[in-house]
């Protein structure tokens, strides 16, 4: 019973599983996109690969009232070790360079797929 109880409790999600779930969510968004994602909202672009999860969240957190990316925002917060709030500006962003949310999501998907292939789960 003790053993079975261990299986029943959720426990921490392995990083590889969390990354795969995030990739799957981004695939859903890109495939189910009919109208312009988040009404064509623009977000800051990112100029580095390190610290990417927090920087991506800092970009996307500024998009409000867009239910399509709310799950992505939540999932990214699980990868970012610090609290992120709207209006934050990371040194990872390309200042004065904004791109459409739809393109940002597509680019994020590309980058995460590469990380997954290379076994970089954190």
């Amino acid at each position: 019973l003790t053993c079975l109880g261990g299986f029943a409790s959720p426990g921490p999600v392995p990083p590889s599983t969390a990354l795969r779930e995030l990739i799957e969510e981004l695939v859903n968004i890109t495939q189910n996109q009919k109208a312009p994602l988040c009404n064509g909202s623009m977000v800051w672009s990112i100029n580095l690969t390190a610290g990417m999860y927090c920087a991506a969240l800092e970009s996307l957190i500024n998009v409000s009232g867009c239910s399509a990316i709310e799950k992505t925002q939540r999932m990214l917060s699980g990868f970012c070790p610090h609290k992120v709030s709207a209006g934050q500006f990371s040194s990872l962003h390309v200042r004065d360079t904004k791109i459409e949310v739809a393109q940002f999501v597509k680019d994020l998907l590309l980058h995460l797929k590469k990380l997954f292939r290379e076994g970089q789960f954190n």
Epitope: S45, F104, D107
Partner: nanobody
Framework: GVQLLESGGGLVQPGGSLRLSCAAS????????MGWARQAPGKGLEWVSR????????YYADSVKGRFTISRDNSKNTLYLQMNSLRAEDTAVYYC???????????WGQGTLVTVLE
């Protein structure tokens, strides 16, 4: 939308040098492997060089190895190709492009002409 804008092409004598630049906008440049391809008059498209997203690896066609150097500045969203010891056979239109293996992430510039005149 996505834009790749090449510059730096021109007329040069054999043995001369040129530096091509490619200004990227509308996408997350830092997350893409990038490259330069060229098309000589009456010939097919040929990959010249590629560079990984954060510049940690570079690749060159045998025909340009030791003469051309690819680099990138992610803070400026810019890709470069330094071309030294130019030869007549390097005459071509040079294109900047994303170099991902998934072709749904396929973006190309309009090209810049490099002419090496004997």
């Amino acid at each position: 939308g996505v834009q790749l804008l090449e510059s730096g092409g021109g007329l040069v004598q054999p043995g001369g040098s040129l530096r091509l630049s490619c200004a990227a906008s509308g996408f997350t440049f830092a997350w893409y492997d990038m490259g330069w391809a060229r098309q000589a008059p009456g010939k097919g498209l040929e990959w010249v060089s590629r560079i990984k997203d954060w510049g940690w690896a570079t690749y060159y066609a045998d025909s340009v190895k030791g003469r051309f150097t690819i680099s990138r500045d992610n803070s400026k969203n810019t890709l470069y190709l330094q071309m030294n010891s130019l030869r007549a056979e390097d005459t071509a239109v040079y294109y900047c492009a994303t170099a991902e293996r998934d072709d749904t992430f396929d973006y190309w510039g309009q090209g810049t002409l490099v002419t090496v005149l004997e």
